[in-house]
């Protein structure tokens, strides 16, 4: 006996975009107030009723006169084939499902979208479908003529399909990949036809869960929430993903305008706990993340402001600043960093309610400092504010050190010409801008005889012409506040420098290592003096002060060059501040082979000898210590006499070589010559690192024995 509650008035509608069949039906004979648990068995066939492709049991509670709904999404676009739908019903008795009494089947409902397609020769479906990467998609074409061969292509590559009927073929795409933002092209064409029909399959990259979701407040009025949205889904067709914030305690919701951040107004009724759900959503899926926090634990203070310095003195300054109100007078912990010359030199932590104050001490006079301050919630640290930075300069003080002074003394026409040199004070010593240097010259024989000289900065030298008596010279540096301690030096007419022997030293790439004998008696220190550019008229005089217990030092300078001889003088400074020369040193940072040969004068030419001399050859100006000379003599005979040795030159010519071992010997007699013979000679200096160039030889022919001298 058929069931009295059979499904009736079955209507089927379609949604092509979503490839959905939507069923609507009712159950008659149910009393108005009656409720009944029922199960409906739905069958869907494709192309013909016997080809059932889907069976589903749909359970629901049915009320009297209620319209019932059920939807089914087709893998195959609905335009590709006819679909048939029918259903039957049973009372849903969960205890004995196998003993259900089914109603009769409803009649088949036919859905044929192809009827409404129009008269074009070829159609491809689905149109503009949006799917996620990795999905499986079914494509089909519908042809209006059976004669033609139709080929379909995925991005230009032919696809293999299966025929559903003479006019329809379908293609299954598996695990589709994202190709480009404008979608994946699929097109079909009729062989020997003039038309291409295409569709776009929009493949979206999978929507990612937002990462690093976090909220904070700067002012207790707005919560600023940020997150990393992850990779873009990569499509232009659909609107990109949207983001929604929902707060469960207040029940409020906001649609975020931006992809990676959103602002939330803090409730005026001082809600402390917040439970946020951030939902990322696109056409295909939703992703949510949650955070729960106490507002007071998420305070990111605004940067301090009004940073000022008051009571700035020579070594101290008071730093003050304000902080933005953070509601309920939370205590802030502020961190102060003091910078000098770009480095952190002090760090301080200060607790602050509204105004901050800190005394910075141990500072240097006339020095520019930079101080920066940032603050964070003292009770529940979350984040530091940005730094606020301000500069200040301490007050000047009188210079703290005497200038480093030296002198050069020359005797000119019975007078003593003294050039005084001094080094500028370092910033730490100057304590302010040096304006001038005062020089007091005191005649030691007449203590009342004072001479005062003022030299404006930045000069670092001055010249004094004195007679041959002894003078004490005082040099002070002056800034706007005061005067430095004095540097004292005694000069006298006769420095007695010349009696000291000169000693050779060997330089290295690190400089010159100098040592000297300790001096007996009272000595206040030593000075080493040299010229950085000994070949220049202004030799760039340099000096180095050393303590009384020092007997060695290394002199290095960026100005030192290979092949240049440097002369060093070591002075002792007596307790009376009188400098006296102790030792002289000379050397090269690196010796080079002699670069030129002496200009040789030939004299006393006889039939058996001639004399060579090079008196004006300066060994001091050579690029290495000259150890002696080689005299080369070429002759037709090629015979070498005792005192010489055979030498082969670079051009393979053979000559006789005479060696002179004394660099001071600048004359040589070439003997044992033949009358009326042709000779060539060359004189080269030699040193530890080589000899002068083998340049052009000078030609000479000896006269006959009877020629007058």
């Amino acid at each position: 006996e058929p069931l009295p509650w059979a499904p009736e008035s079955l209507k089927v509608s379609i949604n092509s975009t979503h490839q959905c069949l939507h069923l609507q039906w009712s159950v008659h004979n149910l009393a108005y107030h009656q409720e009944l648990k029922m199960v409906f068995q739905i069958e869907i066939s494709r192309i013909k009723t016997s080809n059932v492709i889907w069976v589903e049991n749909y359970s629901t509670t049915v009320k009297g006169n209620q319209l019932l709904h059920w939807s089914w999404e087709s893998q195959l676009p609905l335009e590709c084939a006819k679909h048939f739908i029918r259903m039957r019903s049973a009372v849903d008795d969960a205890t004995t499902p196998e003993q259900r009494f089914w109603s009769n089947w409803s009649s088949w409902e036919e859905v044929d979208v192809q009827n409404s397609l129009g008269h074009e020769p070829l159609f491809v479906f689905p149109k503009d479908k949006l799917v996620e990467e990795g999905s499986n998609v079914t494509i089909c074409y519908v042809s209006r003529s059976q004669q033609n061969n139709i080929s379909c292509y995925l991005e230009g590559v032919r696809m293999q399909g299966q025929q559903l009927d003479p006019n329809v073929s379908m293609f299954n795409l598996h695990n589709v990949a994202f190709i480009r933002e404008t979608g994946t092209n699929i097109y079909c064409k009729v062989d020997r036809g003039d038309d291409i029909k295409g569709i776009v399959l929009f493949v979206s990259k999978i929507l990612e869960e937002p990462k690093d979701f976090s909220c904070e407040t700067r002012d207790f009025q707005t919560l600023s929430c940020t997150w990393d949205p992850g990779r873009d889904t990569g499509l232009l067709k659909q609107l990109p993903q949207s983001y929604t914030l929902f707060e469960s305690f207040s029940g409020k919701k906001t649609l975020c305008k931006h992809k990676g951040w959103c602002n939330w107004q803090v409730a005026p009724e001082s809600q402390e706990m917040y439970n946020f759900t951030l939902t990322a959503e696109n056409y295909l899926r939703k992703r949510s993340v949650h955070i729960l926090f106490n507002l007071t634990h998420r305070v990111h203070p605004m940067a301090p402001f009004n940073v000022l310095f008051k009571d700035v003195s020579v070594t101290n300054a008071t730093m003050t600043w304000k902080v933005h109100s953070t509601g309920n007078y939370y205590t802030l912990l502020c961190q102060v960093e003091l910078y000098g010359e770009g480095k952190v030199i002090q760090k301080h932590n200060v607790s602050v309610k509204v105004n901050g104050e800190l005394v910075l001490s141990g500072l240097e006079p006339d020095t520019e400092y930079s101080a920066q301050v940032r603050c964070a919630n003292a009770n529940h640290f979350w984040k530091w504010s940005e730094w606020t930075r301000q500069n200040f300069t301490t007050v000047e003080a009188a210079p703290s050190e005497a200038p480093d002074v030296w002198r050069n003394v020359k005797s000119v026409q019975g007078y003593c010409v003294v050039t005084l040199f001094w080094k500028p004070l370092s910033r730490l010593q100057a304590n302010g801008e040096i304006l001038f240097y005062n020089i007091v010259v005191e005649d030691l024989d007449r203590p009342s005889g004072l001479q005062l000289l003022s030299v404006p900065a930045p000069a670092n030298r001055t010249e004094l012409t004195l007679d041959q008596r002894a003078y004490q010279i005082h040099v002070t540096a002056n800034n706007s506040v005061g005067t430095s301690p004095a540097s004292v030096l005694v000069v006298s007419g006769d420095p007695g420098d010349e009696e000291v022997e000169e000693e050779r030293v060997k330089g290295t790439e690190d400089g010159f290592s100098l040592s000297w004998k300790p001096q007996p008696g009272n000595i206040t220190g030593y000075i080493v003096e040299w010229c950085d550019r000994p070949r220049d008229p202004l030799c760039d005089l340099q000096w180095k002060h050393l303590g009384p217990n020092t007997t060695s030092t290394v002199i290095s300078s960026d100005a030192f060059r290979p092949g240049v001889r440097y002369n060093f003088r070591i002075y002792g400074i007596s307790t009376e501040m009188v400098p006296y020369l102790l030792e002289k040193k000379t050397g090269y940072s690196q010796e080079l082979a002699p670069s030129d040969n002496p200009r040789v004068v030939m004299s006393n030419l006889t039939s058996h000898s001639f004399t060579l001399s090079w008196k004006d050859y300066s060994t001091e100006s050579q690029p290495s210590f000259i150890r002696g000379y080689h005299v080369y003599l070429k002759s037709k005979a090629g015979q070498c006499h005792p005192g010489s040795e055979k030498a082969v030159l670079s051009d393979d010519s053979v000559c006789c070589k005479y060696k002179i071992d004394d660099p001071k010997q600048k004359m040589f007699v070439v003997g044992n010559l033949q009358p009326e013979s042709f000779y060539e000679f060359l004189v080269t200096p030699y040193s530890a690192v080589g000899e002068g160039p083998h340049g052009a030889f000078t030609k000479v022919t000896t006269p006959d024995e009877y020629s007058p001298m």
Epitope: G118, E120, F123, K127, D128, Y153, E155, G156, R180, E181, T182, G183, N185, Y187, D195, I196, K197, G198, V200, L236, K237
Partner: antibody
Framework: DVKLVESGEGLVKPGGSLKLSCAAS????????MSWVRQTPEKRLEWVTY????????YYADTVKGRFTISRDNARNTLYLQMSSLKSEDTAMYYC???????????WGQGTLVTVSA | DIQMTQTTSSLSASLGDRVTISCRAS??????LNWYQQKPDGTVKLLIY???TLHSGVPSRFSGSGSGTDFSLTISNLEQEDIATYFC?????????FGGGTKLEIK
């Protein structure tokens, strides 16, 4: 036969506006995406804008974004290009094209000349 | 933007010659390259799409090849009616861009 006929050519001052039309015939207009492509006086071809068959999405070249609007009337078989804030560099021959495959311009009209000059 | 470069802006050939026109993309466009022919009167036709597929009505003497960044159009037996300017174009990424064109002339 596929036929595309552009109209609306003219001389416009910089900053001015102009609307181009493209009348389509010989095919089912509503089934195809369409584009506008222009050719500069130096004979360089530039894609300008694209509209899908249903008119529900469109793409623009950066050079015209915010100034040009593409639209279509499938009932009238007509494609439009509304151009505003015109610049001298918009001077070109404007072609309408039928695109069976996104980014492939299978059929072209004869073109309509737009001159932007003071 | 993807730059399309046609290094040869003009080319002279004799009727019956085999002519090759090349095109280079500034980045990989897989096989999404199209070729167009513009006649001296300004009419434009699609010749080849997806690198090597002949559009309907295009004579078989036209062929295309290449992949990635280097592509070419070949006319195997030049005819008088082939005198035109040939443009390549990529459809892989927005904005869709064209080469500068190669003008083909008869020697």
């Amino acid at each position: 036969d596929v036929k595309l006929v552009e109209s609306g050519e003219g001389l416009v001052k910089p900053g001015g506006s102009l609307k181009l039309s493209c009348a389509a015939s010989g095919f089912t207009f509503s089934s195809y995406a369409m584009s506008w492509v222009r050719q500069t006086p130096e004979k360089r071809l530039e894609w300008v804008t694209y509209i899908s068959s249903g008119g529900d999405y469109f793409y623009y070249a950066d050079t015209v974004k915010g100034r040009f609007t593409i639209s279509r009337d499938n009932a009238r078989n007509t494609l439009y290009l509304q151009m505003s804030s015109l610049k001298s560099e918009d001077t070109a021959m404007y072609y309408c094209t039928r695109d069976p495959i996104t980014g492939t311009f299978a059929y072209w009209g004869q073109g309509t000349l737009v001159t932007v000059s003071a | 933007d993807i730059q399309m470069t046609q290094t040869t802006s003009s080319l002279s050939a004799s009727l019956g010659d085999r002519v090759t026109i090349s095109c280079r993309a500034s980045q990989d466009i897989t096989n999404y390259l199209n070729w167009y022919q513009q006649k001296p009167d300004g009419t434009v036709k699609l010749l080849i799409y997806y690198t090597s597929t002949l559009h309907s009505g295009v004579p078989s003497r036209f062929s295309g090849s290449g992949s990635g960044t280097d592509f070419s159009l070949t006319i195997s037996n030049l005819e008088q009616e082939d005198i035109a300017t040939y443009f390549c174009q990529q459809g892989h990424m927005l904005p869709w861009t064209f080469g500068g064109g190669t003008k083909l002339e008869i020697k």
